[in-house]
């Protein structure tokens, strides 16, 4: 009898109620391998999920996140809200990075500007909420009388926005 079940192809299941005949998977279910005794329920892409690939009798549906969200986890099992560059996501929504910190992604958290002086360098371009500082030559490398046009960036300490 086991041999009968092993003959059931993907897209079917071995129906014990019908003398182990191979029956097609019911609507909204699938079996991706042969010899299955049940079909699996199709994944539904709803809420913050949208359908990338419809379910078929032999393969599960695949989901993406709707616009304004990004995928996390295997097979996009989770969706997390996007923010703008220069922000981070908190429970109260997207918040601007604190002064001295930046985020160049639509996801993730703000992190401190690089402290150029720790490497003996000076600040060539100021940091913003969206971009890290750009470090230039060390002050000693500058021509006589020249000095850094901007003050050194704050030390790399974590920001303090509420999460």
């Amino acid at each position: 009898l086991q041999d009968l079940c092993s003959n059931c192809p993907a897209g079917t299941f071995c129906d014990n109620n019908r003398s182990q005949i191979c029956s097609p998977c019911p609507p909204n279910s699938f079996s991706s391998a042969g010899g299955q005794r049940t079909c699996d329920i199709c994944r539904q892409c709803k809420g913050v999920f949208k359908t990338r690939k419809e379910c078929s009798s032999t393969s599960n549906a695949e989901c993406d996140c709707i616009s304004g969200y990004h995928c996390l986890g295997a097979e996009c099992s989770m969706c997390e809200q996007d923010c703008k560059q220069g922000q981070e996501l908190t429970k109260k929504g997207c918040k601007d990075c604190c002064f001295g910190t930046f985020n160049d992604q639509k996801r993730g958290i703000c992190r401190p500007w690089t402290n150029c002086s720790l490497d003996g360098k000076s600040v060539l371009v100021n940091g913003t909420k969206e971009r890290d500082v750009v470090c230039g030559p060390s002050p000693a490398d500058l021509s006589p009388g020249a000095s850094s046009a901007t003050p050194p960036a704050p030390a790399r300490e974590p920001g303090h926005s509420p999460q």
């Epitope: 295997a74 989770m78 997390e80 958290i109 401190p112 790399r156 920001g159 303090h160």
Partner: antibody, heavy 116, light 109 residues
Framework: QVQLVQSGAEVKKPGESLKISCKGS????????ISWVRQMPGKGLEWMGK????????NYSPSFQGQVTISADKSISTAYLQWSSLKASDTAMYYC?????????WGQGTLVTVSS | DIELTQPPSVSVAPGQTARISCSGD??????AHWYQQKPGQAPVVVIY???NRPSGIPERFSGSNSGNTATLTISGTQAEDEADYYC???????????FGGGTKLTVLG
């Protein structure tokens, strides 16, 4: 598909140094935080610290500050956890995980045993 | 540092509802996440951002979070739910993540 693959189990003596690794694949390694999590035998999960591989910015749990060093080499999509002088109390399973709050992918863990 | 406190163990009969609490000062101001860990395996997210369930996690898992307590609820608990459960949160103050001490869920019978 996204994977975090950790280096193999280590057996060390007290006072020795050690560096374990976590190699990411299947995603933009530089732009996602990597956290390290300790689990001592029969105990719970403890967050140790994290690194942003894009610029190697790190921050540590106060409990682990100065005890370990977290680093990364984005050119080979690998994060590291290292000790300069191991203690018997460092015996534990160490996991790397992607993320800073929601840890959506985990390595298989590296078992570190420190015994004289 | 925020500290998260969980009961060390919770027991439940099959088919009954299990509730696992996670207490911490004003944890409701931050997102709480829940992880399930079975012996010899890495943890898996079962609830994220207080109440969201990843796809592939059964509908019997749910979460809530307000005030000083986050709660993981498993309705109609099954034998396969026996595992260790950890709450976790991330706080922007110091940019730290923290796990609760963990709760061993035993499904009786």
């Amino acid at each position: 598909q996204v994977q975090l693959v950790q280096s193999g189990a280590e057996v060390k003596k007290p006072g020795e140094s050690l560096k374990i690794s976590c190699k990411g694949s299947g995603y933009s390694f530089s732009t996602y935080w990597i956290s390290w999590v300790r689990q001592m035998p029969g105990k719970g999960l403890e967050w140790m610290g994290k690194i942003y591989p894009g610029d190697s910015y790190t921050n540590y749990s106060p409990s682990f500050q100065g005890q370990v060093t977290i680093s990364a080499d984005k050119s080979i999509s690998t994060a590291y956890l290292q000790w300069s002088s191991l203690k018997a109390s460092d015996t534990a399973m160490y996991y790397c995980a992607r993320g800073y709050g929601i840890f959506d992918y985990w390595g298989q863990g590296t078992l570190v045993t420190v015994s004289s | 540092d925020i500290e998260l406190t969980q009961p060390p163990s919770v027991s439940v009969a099959p088919g009954q509802t299990a509730r696992i609490s996670c207490s911490g000062d004003n944890i409701g101001d931050q997102y709480a996440h829940w992880y399930q860990q079975k012996p010899g395996q890495a943890p898996v997210v079962v609830i994220y951002q207080d109440k969201n369930r990843p796809s592939g996690i059964p509908e019997r898992f749910s979460g809530s979070n307000s005030g000083n307590t986050a709660t993981l609820t498993i309705s109609g608990t099954q034998a396969e739910d026996e595992a260790d459960y950890y709450c976790a949160t991330y706080t922007g103050f110091g940019s730290l993540a923290v796990f609760g001490g963990g709760t061993k869920l035993t499904v009786l019978g």
